[in-house]
Amino acid sequence: SEVEYRAEVGQNAYLPCFYTPAAPGNLVPVCWGKGACPVFECGNVVLRTDERDVNYWTSRYWLNGDFRKGDVSLTIENVTLADSGIYCCRIQIPGIMNDEKFNLKLVIKPAKVTPAPTRQRDFTAAFPRMLTTRGHGPAETQTLGSLPDINLTQISTLANELRDSRLANDLRDSGATIRIG
Protein backbone atom coordinates (compact mmCIF):
# COMPACT_ATOMS: atom_id res chain seq x y z
CA SER A 1 0.00 0.00 0.00
CA GLU A 2 1.10 3.57 -0.61
CA VAL A 3 0.14 6.68 1.34
CA GLU A 4 0.93 10.23 0.23
CA TYR A 5 2.58 12.84 2.42
CA ARG A 6 3.27 16.49 1.67
CA ALA A 7 5.81 19.11 2.66
CA GLU A 8 6.94 22.45 1.31
CA VAL A 9 10.36 23.28 -0.07
CA GLY A 10 12.63 24.30 2.81
CA GLN A 11 10.56 22.51 5.44
CA ASN A 12 11.31 19.21 7.12
CA ALA A 13 9.31 16.30 5.75
CA TYR A 14 7.98 13.55 7.99
CA LEU A 15 7.38 9.98 6.81
CA PRO A 16 5.82 7.81 9.53
CA CYS A 17 6.68 4.18 10.15
CA PHE A 18 6.19 2.21 13.36
CA TYR A 19 6.45 -1.24 14.82
CA THR A 20 5.89 -2.50 18.34
CA PRO A 21 8.87 -4.29 19.89
CA ALA A 22 7.94 -7.31 21.99
CA ALA A 23 9.88 -5.68 24.83
CA PRO A 24 11.88 -2.46 25.19
CA GLY A 25 15.30 -3.00 23.68
CA ASN A 26 14.17 -5.94 21.54
CA LEU A 27 14.68 -3.95 18.37
CA VAL A 28 14.23 -5.05 14.80
CA PRO A 29 16.50 -3.94 11.93
CA VAL A 30 14.83 -1.26 9.81
CA CYS A 31 15.96 0.38 6.59
CA TRP A 32 14.75 3.47 4.76
CA GLY A 33 15.43 3.82 1.06
CA LYS A 34 14.73 6.36 -1.67
CA GLY A 35 12.67 4.40 -4.14
CA ALA A 36 10.07 1.68 -3.76
CA CYS A 37 10.81 -1.39 -1.64
CA PRO A 38 12.58 -4.02 -3.74
CA VAL A 39 12.49 -7.76 -3.12
CA PHE A 40 15.08 -7.56 -0.31
CA GLU A 41 16.26 -4.71 1.90
CA CYS A 42 15.89 -1.13 0.61
CA GLY A 43 17.18 0.29 -2.63
CA ASN A 44 19.36 3.39 -2.28
CA VAL A 45 19.51 3.21 1.51
CA VAL A 46 19.42 6.55 3.31
CA LEU A 47 19.20 5.25 6.89
CA ARG A 48 19.42 1.97 8.78
CA THR A 49 18.94 0.71 12.29
CA ASP A 50 20.05 -2.62 13.69
CA GLU A 51 19.09 -4.45 16.88
CA ARG A 52 20.70 -1.71 18.95
CA ASP A 53 21.18 1.60 17.20
CA VAL A 54 21.10 3.67 14.04
CA ASN A 55 24.12 2.29 12.23
CA TYR A 56 23.99 4.06 8.87
CA TRP A 57 22.58 7.39 7.81
CA THR A 58 23.14 10.00 5.17
CA SER A 59 22.99 13.77 5.20
CA ARG A 60 19.58 15.30 6.07
CA TYR A 61 17.91 12.00 6.96
CA TRP A 62 17.29 11.18 10.62
CA LEU A 63 14.95 9.59 13.12
CA ASN A 64 13.31 12.17 15.32
CA GLY A 65 11.18 9.78 17.36
CA ASP A 66 12.14 7.15 19.89
CA PHE A 67 13.25 4.32 17.64
CA ARG A 68 13.90 2.16 20.72
CA LYS A 69 10.13 2.09 21.18
CA GLY A 70 9.53 1.28 17.53
CA ASP A 71 9.09 4.81 16.17
CA VAL A 72 11.26 4.62 13.06
CA SER A 73 9.59 7.54 11.28
CA LEU A 74 11.93 9.34 8.92
CA THR A 75 12.56 13.07 8.99
CA ILE A 76 14.08 14.66 5.89
CA GLU A 77 15.62 18.02 6.66
CA ASN A 78 15.19 21.10 4.46
CA VAL A 79 13.52 19.36 1.52
CA THR A 80 13.84 20.32 -2.12
CA LEU A 81 11.68 19.35 -5.08
CA ALA A 82 14.18 16.57 -5.83
CA ASP A 83 13.15 14.84 -2.61
CA SER A 84 9.75 14.04 -4.10
CA GLY A 85 9.08 10.39 -4.80
CA ILE A 86 8.57 7.02 -3.16
CA TYR A 87 10.35 6.06 0.05
CA CYS A 88 10.57 2.55 1.42
CA CYS A 89 10.32 1.73 5.11
CA ARG A 90 11.23 -1.92 5.61
CA ILE A 91 10.93 -3.60 8.98
CA GLN A 92 13.16 -6.66 8.87
CA ILE A 93 11.33 -8.95 11.22
CA PRO A 94 13.51 -11.94 12.12
CA GLY A 95 12.61 -15.19 10.44
CA ILE A 96 11.88 -16.54 6.99
CA MET A 97 10.20 -14.07 4.65
CA ASN A 98 8.77 -12.02 7.52
CA ASP A 99 9.64 -8.51 6.37
CA GLU A 100 6.97 -5.83 6.42
CA LYS A 101 7.44 -3.12 3.81
CA PHE A 102 5.72 0.19 3.29
CA ASN A 103 5.95 2.50 0.29
CA LEU A 104 5.29 6.13 1.20
CA LYS A 105 4.92 8.84 -1.41
CA LEU A 106 6.41 12.22 -0.61
CA VAL A 107 5.12 15.21 -2.56
CA ILE A 108 7.10 18.41 -2.24
CA LYS A 109 5.23 21.63 -2.95
CA PRO A 110 6.94 24.91 -3.85
CA ALA A 111 7.29 27.21 -0.87
CA LYS A 112 4.57 29.83 -0.50
CA VAL A 113 7.20 32.32 0.64
CA THR A 114 10.68 32.17 -0.84
CA PRO A 115 12.99 30.93 1.93
CA ALA A 116 16.40 32.38 2.66
CA PRO A 117 19.21 30.75 0.67
CA THR A 118 20.19 27.41 2.16
CA ARG A 119 23.07 25.05 1.63
CA GLN A 120 22.57 22.77 -1.36
CA ARG A 121 22.11 19.07 -0.76
CA ASP A 122 25.26 16.99 -0.81
CA PHE A 123 24.06 14.46 -3.35
CA THR A 124 21.09 13.49 -5.42
CA ALA A 125 19.03 10.90 -3.62
CA ALA A 126 16.33 10.44 -6.22
CA PHE A 127 16.29 6.82 -7.35
CA PRO A 128 17.15 5.89 -9.96
CA ARG A 129 16.43 8.50 -12.57
CA MET A 130 18.84 11.16 -11.33
CA LEU A 131 21.50 8.67 -10.42
CA THR A 132 24.91 9.21 -11.99
CA THR A 133 27.38 7.21 -9.97
CA ARG A 134 27.24 4.09 -7.89
CA GLY A 135 28.69 3.61 -4.45
CA HIS A 136 29.30 0.48 -2.44
CA GLY A 137 28.93 1.99 1.00
CA PRO A 138 27.59 0.12 3.99
CA ALA A 139 24.45 -1.74 3.10
CA GLU A 140 23.72 -3.17 6.50
CA THR A 141 25.65 -3.40 9.77
CA GLN A 142 23.84 -5.56 12.24
CA THR A 143 24.84 -6.88 15.62
CA LEU A 144 26.39 -10.34 15.70
CA GLY A 145 25.44 -13.15 18.02
CA SER A 146 22.14 -14.81 18.76
CA LEU A 147 19.07 -12.79 17.92
CA PRO A 148 16.69 -11.79 20.70
CA ASP A 149 13.46 -13.72 20.92
CA ILE A 150 11.26 -11.14 19.28
CA ASN A 151 7.56 -11.84 19.07
CA LEU A 152 6.26 -8.79 17.31
CA THR A 153 2.59 -8.24 17.77
CA GLN A 154 1.97 -5.30 15.51
CA ILE A 155 3.39 -2.95 12.97
CA SER A 156 1.81 0.43 12.53
CA THR A 157 1.83 2.87 9.68
CA LEU A 158 -0.20 5.97 9.03
CA ALA A 159 -3.86 5.67 8.13
CA ASN A 160 -4.77 6.79 4.64
CA GLU A 161 -6.52 9.95 5.74
CA LEU A 162 -3.35 11.34 7.35
CA ARG A 163 -1.82 13.12 4.39
CA ASP A 164 0.13 16.00 5.80
CA SER A 165 3.46 16.12 7.64
CA ARG A 166 2.06 18.43 10.30
CA LEU A 167 -0.31 15.68 11.46
CA ALA A 168 2.61 13.68 12.81
CA ASN A 169 1.63 14.32 16.41
CA ASP A 170 -1.73 12.63 15.87
CA LEU A 171 -0.11 9.53 14.45
CA ARG A 172 -0.18 7.28 17.49
CA ASP A 173 -3.93 7.57 17.80
CA SER A 174 -4.60 7.14 14.11
CA GLY A 175 -2.20 4.47 12.92
CA ALA A 176 -3.36 1.43 11.05
CA THR A 177 -2.18 -1.79 12.65
CA ILE A 178 -0.91 -4.97 11.04
CA ARG A 179 -0.76 -7.97 13.31
CA ILE A 180 1.92 -10.58 12.76
CA GLY A 181 1.56 -14.20 13.69
Partner: antibody, heavy 118, light 111 residues
Protein backbone atom coordinates in the same frame (compact mmCIF):
# COMPACT_ATOMS: atom_id res chain seq x y z
CA UNK B 1 39.10 -6.04 -4.42
CA UNK B 2 35.91 -7.90 -3.59
CA UNK B 3 36.45 -11.65 -3.66
CA UNK B 4 33.99 -14.48 -3.14
CA UNK B 5 35.30 -18.06 -3.19
CA UNK B 6 32.89 -20.99 -3.05
CA UNK B 7 33.77 -24.52 -1.96
CA UNK B 8 32.11 -27.76 -0.94
CA UNK B 9 30.73 -28.97 -4.24
CA UNK B 10 31.12 -32.51 -5.49
CA UNK B 11 29.21 -35.68 -6.26
CA UNK B 12 26.30 -36.54 -3.97
CA UNK B 13 23.72 -39.31 -4.18
CA UNK B 14 20.02 -38.44 -4.44
CA UNK B 15 18.60 -37.93 -0.95
CA UNK B 16 22.02 -36.99 0.39
CA UNK B 17 23.29 -33.81 2.00
CA UNK B 18 26.03 -31.29 1.32
CA UNK B 19 27.21 -28.00 2.79
CA UNK B 20 28.59 -25.28 0.57
CA UNK B 21 30.76 -22.44 1.81
CA UNK B 22 31.64 -19.04 0.44
CA UNK B 23 34.65 -17.16 1.80
CA UNK B 24 34.40 -13.40 1.36
CA UNK B 25 37.16 -10.79 1.38
CA UNK B 26 37.83 -7.26 0.19
CA UNK B 27 34.72 -5.70 1.74
CA UNK B 28 32.93 -5.47 5.08
CA UNK B 29 31.11 -8.79 4.90
CA UNK B 30 28.94 -8.04 7.93
CA UNK B 31 27.47 -5.02 6.15
CA UNK B 32 25.93 -6.81 3.17
CA UNK B 33 23.14 -9.23 2.47
CA UNK B 34 24.28 -12.34 0.62
CA UNK B 35 22.71 -14.81 -1.81
CA UNK B 36 23.13 -18.19 -3.41
CA UNK B 37 22.32 -18.39 -7.12
CA UNK B 38 22.63 -21.58 -9.17
CA UNK B 39 22.96 -22.52 -12.80
CA UNK B 40 22.14 -25.98 -14.11
CA UNK B 41 24.37 -27.26 -16.92
CA UNK B 42 23.70 -25.34 -20.15
CA UNK B 43 20.80 -23.56 -18.45
CA UNK B 44 19.98 -20.14 -17.11
CA UNK B 45 20.37 -18.59 -13.67
CA UNK B 46 18.11 -19.35 -10.71
CA UNK B 47 18.15 -17.50 -7.41
CA UNK B 48 18.20 -19.90 -4.45
CA UNK B 49 18.37 -18.03 -1.14
CA UNK B 50 19.08 -14.68 0.53
CA UNK B 51 20.28 -13.80 4.04
CA UNK B 52 20.50 -10.30 5.52
CA UNK B 53 23.75 -9.01 6.96
CA UNK B 54 22.85 -9.85 10.53
CA UNK B 55 21.07 -13.11 9.63
CA UNK B 56 17.71 -11.79 10.85
CA UNK B 57 15.95 -12.01 7.50
CA UNK B 58 16.03 -15.04 5.21
CA UNK B 59 14.30 -15.79 1.91
CA UNK B 60 14.23 -19.03 -0.11
CA UNK B 61 13.11 -20.05 -3.57
CA UNK B 62 10.10 -22.35 -3.50
CA UNK B 63 12.15 -25.08 -5.18
CA UNK B 64 14.48 -25.40 -2.16
CA UNK B 65 12.27 -24.33 0.76
CA UNK B 66 12.40 -26.88 3.56
CA UNK B 67 15.46 -28.59 2.12
CA UNK B 68 18.13 -25.88 2.03
CA UNK B 69 19.30 -23.62 4.85
CA UNK B 70 21.30 -20.46 4.31
CA UNK B 71 23.46 -19.13 7.14
CA UNK B 72 26.52 -16.99 7.72
CA UNK B 73 29.39 -16.53 10.14
CA UNK B 74 30.25 -12.84 10.09
CA UNK B 75 33.41 -13.03 12.24
CA UNK B 76 34.76 -15.59 9.76
CA UNK B 77 33.46 -13.75 6.67
CA UNK B 78 31.78 -16.91 5.47
CA UNK B 79 28.41 -17.73 3.90
CA UNK B 80 26.95 -21.25 3.97
CA UNK B 81 24.30 -23.30 2.21
CA UNK B 82 23.28 -26.51 3.92
CA UNK B 83 21.50 -28.75 1.41
CA UNK B 84 19.50 -31.86 2.33
CA UNK B 85 17.20 -34.27 0.50
CA UNK B 86 19.12 -33.52 -2.68
CA UNK B 87 17.56 -34.29 -6.05
CA UNK B 88 18.98 -34.68 -9.52
CA UNK B 89 17.48 -31.33 -10.46
CA UNK B 90 19.72 -29.67 -7.84
CA UNK B 91 22.71 -30.46 -10.03
CA UNK B 92 24.21 -27.09 -10.88
CA UNK B 93 27.00 -24.61 -10.47
CA UNK B 94 26.34 -22.76 -7.21
CA UNK B 95 27.43 -19.14 -6.94
CA UNK B 96 27.44 -16.89 -3.92
CA UNK B 97 26.57 -13.31 -4.80
CA UNK B 98 26.53 -10.11 -2.82
CA UNK B 99 23.30 -8.10 -2.64
CA UNK B 100 24.13 -4.62 -3.85
CA UNK B 101 22.98 -1.17 -2.85
CA UNK B 102 20.71 -0.95 -5.88
CA UNK B 103 18.85 -4.26 -5.46
CA UNK B 104 21.16 -6.29 -7.66
CA UNK B 105 23.74 -9.06 -7.44
CA UNK B 106 26.79 -6.84 -7.69
CA UNK B 107 29.61 -9.34 -7.08
CA UNK B 108 29.75 -13.07 -7.78
CA UNK B 109 32.11 -15.88 -6.86
CA UNK B 110 33.53 -18.29 -9.42
CA UNK B 111 31.12 -21.01 -8.32
CA UNK B 112 31.32 -24.58 -7.07
CA UNK B 113 29.81 -27.53 -8.92
CA UNK B 114 27.33 -29.85 -7.26
CA UNK B 115 26.36 -33.08 -9.01
CA UNK B 116 23.49 -35.15 -7.65
CA UNK B 117 23.59 -38.58 -9.21
CA UNK B 118 23.55 -42.25 -8.29
CA UNK C 1 6.62 -15.23 -10.04
CA UNK C 2 7.55 -12.61 -12.60
CA UNK C 3 8.61 -14.34 -15.81
CA UNK C 4 11.25 -12.58 -17.92
CA UNK C 5 11.32 -13.48 -21.60
CA UNK C 6 14.44 -12.51 -23.52
CA UNK C 7 14.67 -12.23 -27.28
CA UNK C 8 16.30 -13.23 -29.41
CA UNK C 9 17.69 -16.39 -27.84
CA UNK C 10 20.84 -15.81 -29.85
CA UNK C 11 22.13 -13.25 -32.31
CA UNK C 12 25.21 -12.65 -34.43
CA UNK C 13 26.40 -9.08 -34.87
CA UNK C 14 29.26 -7.75 -36.95
CA UNK C 15 32.14 -6.07 -35.20
CA UNK C 16 31.39 -2.39 -34.67
CA UNK C 17 27.65 -2.77 -35.21
CA UNK C 18 24.81 -2.54 -32.68
CA UNK C 19 23.48 -5.45 -30.65
CA UNK C 20 19.98 -5.08 -29.19
CA UNK C 21 18.57 -7.51 -26.64
CA UNK C 22 14.99 -7.36 -25.41
CA UNK C 23 13.58 -8.44 -22.05
CA UNK C 24 9.82 -8.58 -21.50
CA UNK C 25 8.35 -9.07 -18.02
CA UNK C 26 5.07 -10.90 -17.37
CA UNK C 27 4.06 -7.96 -15.15
CA UNK C 28 5.43 -4.50 -14.47
CA UNK C 29 8.71 -4.21 -12.59
CA UNK C 30 8.13 -0.47 -12.16
CA UNK C 31 6.97 1.39 -9.11
CA UNK C 32 6.23 5.06 -9.61
CA UNK C 33 8.65 5.16 -12.52
CA UNK C 34 11.54 3.38 -10.80
CA UNK C 35 12.53 0.04 -12.33
CA UNK C 36 14.37 -2.73 -10.53
CA UNK C 37 15.71 -4.33 -13.71
CA UNK C 38 19.35 -5.38 -14.02
CA UNK C 39 21.51 -6.80 -16.81
CA UNK C 40 24.41 -9.27 -16.51
CA UNK C 41 27.05 -10.60 -18.87
CA UNK C 42 28.33 -14.16 -18.56
CA UNK C 43 31.23 -15.55 -20.53
CA UNK C 44 31.86 -19.33 -20.79
CA UNK C 45 33.41 -20.71 -17.62
CA UNK C 46 32.91 -17.44 -15.73
CA UNK C 47 30.34 -16.11 -13.27
CA UNK C 48 27.87 -13.44 -14.32
CA UNK C 49 29.01 -9.83 -14.17
CA UNK C 50 26.73 -6.88 -13.42
CA UNK C 51 26.50 -4.43 -16.34
CA UNK C 52 23.39 -2.30 -15.80
CA UNK C 53 21.34 -1.73 -12.65
CA UNK C 54 17.98 -0.03 -12.14
CA UNK C 55 17.20 -0.34 -15.87
CA UNK C 56 19.59 2.29 -17.18
CA UNK C 57 22.51 2.87 -14.82
CA UNK C 58 25.96 1.72 -15.88
CA UNK C 59 27.85 -0.26 -13.27
CA UNK C 60 31.24 1.14 -12.31
CA UNK C 61 34.00 -0.06 -14.65
CA UNK C 62 31.65 -1.14 -17.46
CA UNK C 63 32.36 0.45 -20.86
CA UNK C 64 29.96 3.14 -22.05
CA UNK C 65 29.10 1.13 -25.15
CA UNK C 66 26.68 -0.77 -22.92
CA UNK C 67 23.38 0.97 -22.23
CA UNK C 68 20.02 -0.02 -20.79
CA UNK C 69 16.58 1.44 -21.26
CA UNK C 70 12.92 0.67 -20.76
CA UNK C 71 10.19 0.72 -18.16
CA UNK C 72 7.14 -1.22 -17.09
CA UNK C 73 7.37 -4.57 -18.81
CA UNK C 74 9.69 -3.81 -21.75
CA UNK C 75 13.44 -3.39 -21.32
CA UNK C 76 16.36 -3.27 -23.72
CA UNK C 77 20.11 -3.76 -23.52
CA UNK C 78 22.11 -2.10 -26.29
CA UNK C 79 25.76 -2.68 -27.10
CA UNK C 80 27.30 -0.28 -29.61
CA UNK C 81 29.81 -0.55 -31.08
CA UNK C 82 30.13 -4.28 -30.44
CA UNK C 83 33.65 -5.55 -29.73
CA UNK C 84 35.12 -9.05 -29.88
CA UNK C 85 35.21 -9.31 -26.10
CA UNK C 86 31.43 -8.81 -25.93
CA UNK C 87 30.78 -12.36 -27.10
CA UNK C 88 28.85 -13.78 -24.13
CA UNK C 89 25.40 -14.65 -22.82
CA UNK C 90 23.38 -11.75 -21.43
CA UNK C 91 20.71 -12.05 -18.74
CA UNK C 92 18.09 -9.61 -17.48
CA UNK C 93 16.97 -9.89 -13.84
CA UNK C 94 14.20 -8.24 -11.83
CA UNK C 95 14.36 -7.33 -8.14
CA UNK C 96 10.87 -5.94 -7.85
CA UNK C 97 9.08 -8.97 -6.43
CA UNK C 98 9.91 -12.11 -4.51
CA UNK C 99 11.49 -14.20 -5.86
CA UNK C 100 14.09 -12.36 -7.92
CA UNK C 101 14.01 -13.90 -11.38
CA UNK C 102 16.26 -14.03 -14.44
CA UNK C 103 15.53 -14.09 -18.12
CA UNK C 104 16.48 -17.16 -20.12
CA UNK C 105 19.54 -15.49 -21.60
CA UNK C 106 20.63 -14.22 -25.01
CA UNK C 107 23.80 -15.55 -26.57
CA UNK C 108 25.73 -12.92 -28.53
CA UNK C 109 28.13 -14.00 -31.24
CA UNK C 110 30.48 -11.57 -32.96
CA UNK C 111 30.83 -11.98 -36.73
Amino acid sequence: DVQLVESGGGLVQPGGSRKLSCAASGFTFSSFGMNWVRQAPEKGLEWVAYISSGSSTIYYADTVKGRFTISRDNPKNTLFLQMTSLRSEDTAMYYCARWGRWADFDYWGQGTTLTVSS
Amino acid sequence: DIVLTQSPASLAVSLGQRATISCKASQSVDYDGDSYMNWYQQKPGQPPKLLIYAASNLESGIPARFSGSGSGTDFTLNIHPVEEEDAATYYCQQSNEDPPTFGGGTKLEIK
